[in-house]
Interface confidence: low
């Protein structure tokens, strides 16, 4: 079967886990987590729900270690559970790396467990309206990918790509590419999008025994990156930056400008172990806010993805596809917030706005 | 199954006033924007405002600002039109109808689910 | 706010016959466009989002378009459920406005 990737992995998310599956799942879509379970493991859970709520799951994977061992699947529906469905069986070893596949198949999810065939579990809502994966419990996940079947044979990792066409940027900093982004037929369409790609170079992530060693981009923007936000801002218009934090830095910044203002100034600081936010209005700072819901999200050397959602009275930020923050707008004349700036000590993969 | 149905039309004088209510079923309300539009009798379709609730967000045309209010009840999954200062130009089919949005992904720049309508005359 | 020029007002055409309706923006709405079809005493029902993207359930013979600030609704070849109105509507400000409409009517 011919895979192409259907969105750039996460590499290394941080569990809890919570992030975007872009355009939803769509019969063919195989969806593939490498990582390792604790040696204490008790149990883990990966749920493909509707939302960042978790009120409503389509699917809920869930192997328990206790009572010999066995996994649970169910379903969640404006948050009720549904009959659990029992497979006696566990596929998975406490400590152990492991590999597990999710295949979205037109009348049910097909399970795979380290390349081996281990349970099927029927929809029992439309797959379509999932568009969220979330991970918790007791492991380490090396990665989550998401792959096509049956669309031209391309190297997975050999670029980061989406299930539309991209054309990659001629020059470091990539003028920007339009593209379809949508969501799968029978749930509401998506917004266009504009995409900034990176061209990547083959580069060894990892090398943990048994988990085959993944290719990781190699970004190609110039730092500071500016880019138009066509239209400016507006409720529920969200921007998504990833990248890489350099092993020595001390601090980057992501701001949302309005003209000469800046409307949204987030900037995680390294050697203050905090994330800054303020609005620059005339050249003038206001009152800096830096209240985390939890601990700080950005670390040295470590990748990152960071979603902005603009609403009617705040910024919402989400790191890693975890909230992190809100932020009430100071500057009210959201349309005019117009320009995306990133700068510091990164390196950008991949910008969306 | 995701609905929407409008209700409160009726015939009013000039220059009274209206609540028309939208009550939706079928999808997580606060996720959605929710849209007015009116239909004049042979005429065409015109935006009257939006509401994404979630956010306490809306937006007005420029032909009922500061004579309509839209709000939401997110425990009743029910959007509002409050009409006053009503014209007889305001007589009109009004639809309600859904954008969706879901934390943290894109504007939906269409409208996928509408109501089947109910009709304001506005006449002395 | 933005407007969108949609044209023609009306056209006659027949069963198999491939029809263009076009709307123009005054202003830069991105590909933010949907285009819809409403028969009389009935609510619109959604063709096309984002300028060129087929929403599910809508036959194929129905396409979209962009070219800058023009929009394009195709019907590649005409079937007789498919006489109505269409609108286009953008959504590239904060107002979203629509088109005043085209009526296909069977020649």
């Known amino acids: 079967m011919a895979l192409f990737s259907a969105q750039s992995p996460y590499i290394n998310p941080i569990i809890p886990f919570t992030g975007p599956i872009q355009g939803g799942l769509q019969e063919g879509l195989q969806v593939t987590l490498q990582g390792t379970t604790k040696s204490f493991a008790q149990r883990f859970v990966v749920n493909f729900q509707n939302s960042f709520n978790g009120n409503d799951i389509a699917f809920h994977f869930n192997p328990r270690f206790e009572e010999g061992g066995y996994v649970v699947c169910n379903t969640k529906q404006n948050g009720q559970w549904g009959p659990e469905e029992r497979k006696m069986q566990m596929p998975f070893q406490k400590g152990m790396p492991f590999e597990l596949c999710f295949l979205v198949q037109r009348s049910e999810f097909k399970v795979m467990v380290n390349k081996k065939f281990f349970v099927q579990y029927q929809h029992r809502v439309p797959y379509h309206l999932v568009d969220t994966i979330a991970v918790s419990g007791c492991l380490k996940l090396s990665f989550i990918t998401f792959q096509n079947s049956a669309a031209p044979v391309q190297h997975v990792f050999s670029t980061l790509q989406f299930s539309q066409p991209v054309q990659f940027p001629r020059t470091p900093k990539g003028r920007k590419q339009k593209t379809q982004n949508f969501r799968p037929a029978h749930q509401a369409p998506m917004a266009q999008t504009t995409i900034h790609m990176v061209h990547s170079t083959p580069g060894q992530m990892f090398s943990t025994p048994g988990i085959p060693p993944v290719v990781y981009p190699t970004p190609a923007y110039t730092i500071p990156f500016y880019t138009p936000i066509p239209n400016g801002l507006y409720p529920s218009k969200s921007i998504m930056i990833s990248g890489n934090v350099l092993p020595d830095a001390t601090r980057f910044h992501i701001n949302l400008r309005c003209g000469g203002d800046i409307a949204f100034h987030l900037n995680p600081r390294f050697n203050e172990n905090a994330v800054v936010r303020n609005t620059q209005i005339n050249n003038s700072w206001g009152q800096e806010e830096r209240s985390l819901l939890g601990r700080m999200p950005f670390s040295r050397g470590q990748s990152f993805s960071v979603w902005i959602i603009c609403e009617g009275h705040c910024f919402k930020v989400a790191v890693n596809g975890q909230h992190m923050c809100e932020y009430y707008h100071r500057l009210k004349n959201l349309q005019d917030i117009n320009t995306l700036e990133v700068a510091g000590d990164i390196q950008l993969t991949h910008v969306q706005t | 199954e995701v609905q929407l149905v409008e209700s409160g039309g009726g015939l009013v004088q000039p220059g009274g006033s209206l609540r028309l209510s939208c009550a939706a079923s079928g999808f997580t309300f606060s996720s959605y924007v929710i849209h007015w539009v009116r239909q004049a009798p042979g005429k065409g379709l015109e935006w009257v405002a939006l509401?994404?609730?979630?956010?306490?967000?809306?937006q007005y045309a420029d032909s009922v600002k500061g004579r309509f209010t839209i709000s939401a009840d997110t425990s009743k999954n029910t959007a509002y039109l409050q009409m006053n200062s009503l014209r007889a130009e305001d007589t009109a089919v009004y639809y309600c109808a859904r954008v969706g949005t879901t934390y943290p992904s894109r504007y939906l720049e269409a409208l996928d689910y509408w109501g089947q309508g109910t009709l304001v005359t506005v006449s002395s | 706010d933005i407007q969108m020029t949609q044209s023609p007002s009306s056209l006659s055409a027949s069963v198999g016959d491939r029809v263009t309706i076009t709307c123009r923006a005054s202003?830069?709405?991105?590909?933010?466009v949907a285009w819809y079809q409403q028969k009389p005493g009935k609510a619109p029902k959604l063709l096309i989002y984002s300028a060129s993207s087929l929403y599910s359930g809508v036959p194929s013979r129905f396409s979209g378009s962009r070219s800058g600030t023009d929009f394009t609704l195709t019907i590649s070849s005409l079937q007789p459920e498919d006489f109505a109105t269409y609108y286009c509507?953008?959504?590239?400000?904060?107002?979203?406005?629509f088109g005043q409409g085209t009526k296909v009517e069977i020649k």
């Open positions: 509401i994404y609730s979630s956010g306490g967000y809306t």
């Open positions: 202003q830069s709405v991105s590909s933010a």
């Open positions: 509507q953008q959504f590239g400000s904060s107002l979203p406005t």
